[in-house]
Interface confidence: low
């Protein structure tokens, strides 16, 4: 039985409840539907309490004490994260009326790089209007248990290491967690902390397996050629570094002066054939890489490359 | 002028107490993090404690439990209690502000100190 | 907790000389390095924070590098006023928040 929210390669909810409220008082941003995937295959985080409120000037607001727990459709239970150094309960401080007509949204966004070196975890704000007005910092505060099955529950008061996330590009902060290569099939266990002119959110604890979560570098050395049998191969490189196999996505699109075809396929190899090309066509190709093995998250695609065949395609090419 | 006056030192038995006080003047003490940091005889810096703005408190292993900081943010004072003192405490201590320049965090302003002496 | 150690321990160097200070984290710190002077008798003053940015009021001669786990504060060239002992001090991974031992800058 652990408290931990299990974080895995795909989209959650971070709601912050009220006292006395029921997490039917928060609702999805607009246009967001409760299964909604991340087109880059990022798990994402919103942070989203809503308030209605008339205008009321930021320097007389009274503090409400929220809890933020991940959004669940079967379980709507959350663990706390013990704070690091007193030990008492993490909760979020919002000011409940400095959200005038704004949604208190964060992107949240973890990953091991793929030569396994370096966890990451970017803390987007999209919550625009508040953070141009007010300098905030983000703590990520995080724990490697010994052994895990020593302490399923929450870590004893203490136990947690701080890290201060470097916010120098606005709007999107990055932080650097420490983990050991012995520890990377450890279960990490990790809480944020994002503070802005005196509004305080702090989120559950997050329990995440770094292996788990690698994302690759971008595939190198994308390129296309017509081969002798007249289809084009797309060809690239596995990035440096990687220590295990890729799957890797293809998807490229292709203009003639008749049609516009799109297409993306998933491959092992680092190479794809495609046939029936048109002479005188474009085709715009991108190509991204995730673990094939096991769990993991899609890299970025690679720069765009277009590659233009010729009106006429002689077999075997000239 | 931006300044940090530390008083409140002095000698004191092994296993007594002792409360520090720091007073602030020339900036606008609740928006600044801040910090005690000590130095023994002929030796290096060792952070004691410190306090954000939210009124958190962090400590070293070393004196958890015994050591409380504490801010008053209207009469831009901060303290340091300090109990069950040992030798190993004596030291020089300071009080230092910590600004968040981005977020890079520094001691860009220090007091000048006060001696604790711990001895029978 | 992230250890710093400081190399050399102490050195001798005259004025006008060009004296070079290696602080280097037991882990990773990105760049979340400060860097102090302090005269005998004295508080420790901010020279250089976030392993580069000089503090105001430093004078130029001071500059600091590095990123990572290797850092360098290097004095281009010695003035009288500069023989002191200067710390390395990180702000990464906290709490706890670590100094290295020092470095000693003595006059030739």
């Known amino acids: 039985f652990n408290l931990s929210y299990p974080i895995t390669p795909w989209r959650f909810k971070l709601s912050c409840m009220p006292p006395n409220s029921t997490y039917d008082y928060f609702l999805l941003p607009a246009g967001l539907s409760k299964n909604t995937s991340n087109s880059n295959g990022h798990y994402e985080t919103a942070v989203e309490p809503k308030f209605n409120s008339s205008g009321t000037h930021f320097s007389n607001l009274s503090k409400t004490t929220f809890h933020c727990c991940f959004r669940s459709e079967q379980d709507r239970n959350c663990s706390l994260c013990a704070d690091n150094i007193e030990g008492k309960t993490f909760v979020s401080t919002v000011n409940s009326l400095v959200f005038q007509q704004i949604d208190a949204n964060w992107n949240i966004q973890c990953w091991l790089k793929g030569d396994l070196k370096l966890f990451i975890c970017y803390v987007e704000s999209l919550f625009k209007n508040l953070f141009r007005n007010y300098n905030y910092k983000v703590h990520l505060l995080y724990v490697l248990p010994e052994v895990l099955e020593d302490s399923p529950l929450v870590p004893q008061k203490g136990s947690f290491q701080m890290v201060h996330c470097n916010c120098s590009v606005h709007e999107c902060c990055e932080c650097l967690v420490p983990v050991p290569t012995a520890k990377l099939n450890d279960t990490l266990l990790m809480c944020l902390k994002i503070t802005s002119g005196g509004v305080i959110f702090q989120s559950p604890l997050m329990s995440v397996q770094p292996i788990n979560m690698v994302k690759p570098d971008p595939p190198l050395g994308l390129h296309m050629e017509i081969t002798d049998d007249g289809n084009l191969k797309i060809s690239w490189s596995s990035p440096p570094l990687v220590p295990f196999p890729l799957q890797y996505q293809v998807k490229y699109s292709e203009n003639s002066t008749t049609v516009i075809r799109e297409a993306d396929k998933i491959v092992s190899a680092t190479s794809l054939l495609v046939d029936s090309i048109l002479p005188g066509s474009s085709y715009e190709v991108q190509v991204r890489g995730k673990r094939l093995d096991g769990p993991g998250i899609w890299s970025d695609w690679s720069t765009p490359r277009v590659f233009t065949t010729q009106d006429v395609i002689y077999f075997p090419p000239k | 002028e931006v300044q940090l006056v530390e008083s409140g030192g002095g000698l004191v038995q092994p296993g007594g107490s002792l409360r520090l006080s720091c007073v602030a003047s020339g900036f606008t003490f609740n928006k600044y993090d801040m910090h005690w940091v000590r130095q023994t005889t002929g030796k290096g810096l060792e952070w004691v404690s410190g306090?954000?703005?939210?009124?958190?408190?962090y400590y070293p292993g070393s004196v958890k439990g015994r050591f409380t900081i504490s801010r008053e943010n209207a009469e831009n004072s901060l303290y340091l209690q300090m109990n069950g003192l040992r030798v190993g405490d004596t030291a020089v201590y300071y009080c230092a502000r910590w600004p968040w320049s981005g977020f890079y965090g520094a001691f860009d302003i220090w007091g000048q100190g006060t001696m604790v002496t711990v001895s029978s | 907790d992230i250890q710093m150690t400081q190399s050399p321990s102490s050195l001798s160097a005259s004025v006008g000389d060009r004296v070079t200070i290696t602080c280097r984290a037991s882990?990773?710190?990105?760049?979340?390095l400060n860097w102090y002077q302090q005269k005998p008798g004295k508080a420790p003053k901010l020279l250089i924070y976030?392993?580069?940015s000089l503090q105001s009021g430093v004078p130029s001669r001071f500059s600091g590098s590095g990123s990572g786990t290797d850092f360098t504060l290097t004095i281009s060239s010695l003035q009288p006023e500069d023989f002191a002992t200067y710390y390395c001090q990180q702000s990464y991974s906290t709490p706890p928040i670590t100094f290295g031992q020092g470095t000693r800058l003595e006059i030739k």
């Open positions: 976030a392993a580069s």
């Open positions: 882990q990773s710190i990105s760049s979340y």
């Open positions: 306090i954000d703005t939210d009124g958190d408190t």
